[in-house]
Interface confidence: low
């Protein structure tokens, strides 16, 4: 339930197959509308979110891919965007969430035994980023249409980070988003983990605080890719 993550950004509830995935969710990630990729028709700036610049997909988290944030945007300016879940439009495998791949422009399950059936007809829709919202709505929130006048405290339901009090960000918890503490120096963060795990639980960490970036912990450089530990470190 929500209460299990109200007091921490740590990934506490994940079963073993997910725990090793740096806390990133699997095939059912919902990308809230926001920053758009080619194929979309609107643009929304990010509220209180520092986009992570990238040059290739491998620099992004397991539930992200690297792309230009605007429709037909400058290819030289790319950031990590939320991955596309099953049934969403894609242009390459990396755009699809863990456990999925891009086939005929649609993200489909890479495990053919999950469900048996044909791929649905291609539909035109926006490519989104989970860190912002479009037209004031989010794909996975329980916030009522009436916005709060006071900034949300830790555990409060939110739509975007600007809804949360200082020092908090709006992060996913399954089908909701709640205010969680922005990560401090030395805290474990999520970065650079590539795809491959399954699962539906979504327990998202906040981003690192001001002046910090999510990098491999120095004494973990020799570790295998699957066990690299990332922490918030000074620039």
């Amino acid at each position: 339930t929500l209460n299990s993550v109200l007091n921490s950004n740590a990934i506490k509830n994940l079963p073993p197959p997910l725990g090793g995935a740096a806390g990133h969710p699997g095939s059912a990630v919902s990308a809230a509308p926001g920053i758009l990729y080619p194929g979309g028709n609107k643009y929304q700036t990010i509220d209180n979110y520092q986009p992570y610049p990238c040059a290739e997909d491998e620099e992004c988290g397991t539930d992200e891919y690297c792309a230009s944030p605007t429709r037909g945007g400058d290819a030289g300016v790319q950031i990590c965007l939320a991955c596309r879940k099953r049934r969403k439009r894609c242009m390459r495998h990396a755009m699809c969430c863990p456990g999925n791949y891009c086939k005929n422009g649609i993200c489909v399950s890479s495990d053919q035994n999950h469900f048996r059936g044909e791929i649905e007809e291609t539909i035109t829709e926006s490519f989104g980023n989970d860190h912002s919202t479009l037209d004031g709505y989010s794909r996975r929130t329980t916030l009522s249409s009436k916005m709060y006048h006071t900034k949300g405290q830790e555990g409060s339901v939110c739509l975007r980070s600007s809804d949360c009090a200082s020092g908090l960000c709006c992060a996913r918890h399954f089908w909701s988003k709640i205010c969680k503490p922005v990560l401090k120096e030395g805290q474990v963060c999520t970065k650079h983990r590539r795809k491959g795990s399954h699962g539906l639980e979504i327990f998202q960490r906040c981003y690192c605080g001001e002046g910090l970036s999510c990098r491999i912990q120095k004494d973990h450089h020799q570790a295998s890719n699957s066990s690299r530990l990332h922490t918030c470190q000074r620039h």
Epitope: L14, R86, R116, T124, L134, Y137, R140, T142, L200
Partner: antibody, heavy 118, light 107 residues
Framework: EVQLLESGGGLVQPGGSLRLSCAAS????????MSWVRQAPGKGLEWVSA????????YYADSVKGRFTISRDNSKNTLYLQMNSLRAEDTAVYYC???????????WGQGTLVTVSS | DIQMTQSPSSLSASVGDRVTITCRAS??????LNWYQQKPGKAPKLLIY???GLQSGVPSRFSGSGSGTDFTLTISSLQPEDFATYYC?????????FGQGTKVEIK
Amino acid sequence: EVQLLESGGGLVQPGGSLRLSCAASGFTFDQYDMSWVRQAPGKGLEWVSAITGSGGSTYYADSVKGRFTISRDNSKNTLYLQMNSLRAEDTAVYYCATAESDDTYDYWGQGTLVTVSS
Amino acid sequence: DIQMTQSPSSLSASVGDRVTITCRASQTIGDYLNWYQQKPGKAPKLLIYAASGLQSGVPSRFSGSGSGTDFTLTISSLQPEDFATYYCQQSNSWPYTFGQGTKVEIK
């Protein structure tokens, strides 16, 4: 072929309990969230509860919160709904449902009727 | 919770007719709108997902459109097997909510 088969429905008195089961086959059960949706006689559809693939997170409609408990046994490919303190307004056909996408209910069971009456 | 309102509640039509059912959300839900068909004594069947995506195996005479708060399900040429009750459902916000249904009857 995906199949969902509910059982456990029946007649129960107000305040009583029932446990519904949903046997799943045709897909990798523990990879997907599952839901219970109900439909009162002659009425529309109402989402009741959902559970994540591992069973680690559960969700309930306000109307059943504190009375119903959703659970799953992934080793048996079975979903459950424990219903306590039943009320007349809980009378409905209960469907278990799941989906290849997390946005829809692609697959439904045939439903099991729960009647709460004295 | 997001309220979903369908109209009309029921309608009478003949085979071959073009039928339109509308669904309105109490707040913006983007394209997270699905349509289901239900026949008496049967479980609902998914027709349209994400407002306009045709579910595999569903005849092309069914189509969906709309975004934001207003959505439409259209049956271009009503067939005998299409007489049923149709429900819209939003999956933008938890909990998912359904419309009250539209019953399509034979005129």
